[in-house]
């Protein structure tokens, strides 16, 4: 699980203390930090709203927390992209937006996030319970994909809490090539400085030029992530029960969220960020089914005044041949 | 030089079905969306749908979805188009436009159009 | 399905002269991630088919001479030909390439005095 903690500055060691040999060993380390701190396992956020309006119309959000540039992003439902889901959209960062019926607008809302609506009415509608998923392919991290539905169950009176419910995906190549080696080298860099704790010369102490010491960010692998190595899907429940927009608030109540990050949800920061919507709750969790979500994972507070958000913003990726990855 | 070549102008019966085919040349036949609109007096120009010839995708525009059926021949690089249960309001001429390099929509080459007139 | 409204419906020009016409949508046609506007403008010369003057609102398309100028973002576009040529004479159509189903406006038709 990923967690914020401050770490105390790292001093250089004082001049003649070790040779040649420790001087190099030591530059190791301040790359793999470098490494540790600046990469870390990209996340996808979902967001489902029914509008209390429209009893059948849906808004579902999504976004990428990564450090890649996205090439893509399909939307569909019934299911995750390429196992059962019926595509609903497909986003190109630079050559526009294709979608299909129900799919009523779907639109960039900034460089990480796409907003996608749902048509009311009609056959192919959905339903409350569907199952909702955001595949985002981005270099270098791969294709990562966080599914969700509405809570099963919601009291129309109240608005519905977000409810963290991912379903993690990544593409092993991704996956495997680069946070393989980040991990080996974080796990090797830890067992560096365990080593130089024993001795007197390289020491961890506080920054002299500032009474504050730096923050950087530190993980471990989540059960969750661990778990979409060897598991590439949880079960869903797709059938869909109409019944289940009887709780739906036939004056206009309150809308219900699911929010479902995939990791520890980082908000895109800045003046694009959606101020109005709920920050997803930050945690690991892998989808047993529909409603019945099985926590994988201690669960860390909301941001607060002691963790640092780190901003992540990137330029759009260049176009990927002409008809780009359908 | 991108060609699209459509087949001639078609007379037929209410009630009947016709097929126009867009033959493409000069570029790589399935690297690009293949668009057909339709121009009508009334209307003006309107999106009757899409296919990918690379696989057989198609994504139409509802209001036509029960009038157009949209298929490839990739062995010879032609996009077709079937137009059925015709009725005197179907009347108008028909476009094949290849989707443009830069945008799923931009629409850069056109064919010479297919006028489909539908008379008793 | 946005909606693509031109206006006017025709103009009438001497050569030589600057015109402007107007395209608006019921949707903005910015994408959020390059902050380009998907709109297109076409040219159809009488008994001729559609050609692509402009794409992404202001981007010519090669081999469309400079005099004509796509302009605007969100939901207000205009196409601009700064110095009118007889060959000009001809339907102009705005299209929305933002999203399914592209839409065109109805055409403004310039006509040469």
């Known amino acids: 699980m990923r967690t914020e903690a401050q770490v105390p500055a790292l001093q250089p060691p004082e001049p003649g203390l070790e040779g040649a040999m420790g001087h190099r060993t030591l530059v190791l380390p301040w790359v793999l930090l470098t490494l540790c701190v600046t990469a870390g396992t990209p996340e996808v956020w979902v967001q489902v709203r029914m509008e209390a309006t429209e009893l059948s119309s849906f808004t579902i959000r999504c976004g990428f927390l990564g450090s890649g540039s996205i090439s893509l992003v399909t939307v569909s439902w019934g299911g995750p992209n390429g196992a059962g889901g019926t595509t609903l959209a497909v986003l190109h960062p630079e050559r526009g937006i294709r979608q299909w019926a129900p799919a009523r607008q779907a639109r960039w809302e900034t460089q990480s996030s796409i907003s996608l609506i749902l048509e009311g009415s009609g056959a192919s509608s959905p339903c409350a319970n569907t199952t909702f998923c955001c595949k985002f392919a981005s270099f270098p991290e791969g294709s990562w994909e966080a599914c969700g539905s509405l809570p099963p169950s919601s009291d129309p009176g109240l608005s519905a809490p977000p409810t963290p419910a991912p379903i993690l995906r990544a593409d092993l190549a991704g996956i495997l090539g680069v946070s393989g080696v980040l991990l080996f080298g974080c796990v090797y860099l830890l067992h560096l400085l365990r080593r130089h704790k024993h001795r007197p010369a390289p020491r961890l102490q506080p920054s002299r030029t500032s009474p504050q010491a730096p923050r950087a960010r530190a993980w471990a692998p989540s059960q969750a992530s661990q778990a979409a190595l060897h598991v590439p899907y949880a079960t869903i429940n797709t059938s869909c029960r109409p019944a289940t927009l009887d709780t739906a608030h036939p004056h206009g109540g309150p809308s219900w969220w699911a929010s479902l990050p995939t990791h520890a949800a980082h908000r895109p920061q800045g003046p694009a960020a959606w101020a109005s919507t709920p920050i997803p709750a930050r945690g690991s969790f892998v989808s047993v089914e529909n409603g019945l979500y099985a926590q994988a994972g201690e669960r860390p507070p909301h941001t607060g005044p002691g963790l640092t958000l780190f901003p992540d913003p990137r330029g759009p990726r260049a176009m990927e041949g002409p008809l780009g990855v359908r | 030089e991108v060609q699209l070549q459509q087949s001639g102008p078609e007379l037929v019966k209410p009630g009947t079905s016709v097929k126009i085919s867009c033959k493409a040349s000069g570029y790589t036949f399935t690297d690009y969306y293949m668009n057909w609109v339709r121009q009508s007096h009334e209307k003006s120009l309107e999106w009757i749908g899409e296919i990918n010839p690379k696989n057989g995708d198609t994504n139409y525009n509802q209001n036509f979805k029960a009038k157009a059926t949209l298929t490839v021949d990739k062995s010879s690089n032609t996009a077709y188009m079937e137009l059925r249960s015709l009725t005197s309001e179907d009347s108008a001429v028909f476009y094949c436009?290849?989707?443009?390099?830069?945008?799923?929509?931009?629409?850069?080459?056109w064919g010479q159009g297919t006028s489909v007139t539908v008379s008793s | 399905d946005i909606v693509m409204t031109q206006s006017p419906s025709s103009l009438a020009v001497s050569v030589g002269q600057k015109v402007t016409m107007s395209c608006k949508s019921s949707?903005?046609?910015?994408?959020?991630?390059?902050?380009?506007?998907?709109l297109a403008w076409y040219q159809q010369k009488p008994g001729q088919s559609p050609k692509l003057l402009v794409y992404f609102a202001s981007t010519r398309e090669s081999g469309v001479p400079d005099r004509f100028i796509g302009s605007g973002s969100g939901t207000d576009f205009t196409l601009t030909i700064t110095s009118v040529q007889a060959e000009d004479l001809a339907d102009y159509f705005c299209q929305q390439h933002h999203s399914t189903p592209p839409t065109f406006g109805g055409g403004t038709k310039l006509e040469i005095n």
């Open positions: 949707q903005s046609l910015l994408n959020g991630f390059n902050q380009k506007n998907f």
């Open positions: 436009a290849r989707e443009g390099v830069s945008s799923y929509y931009g629409m850069d080459s």
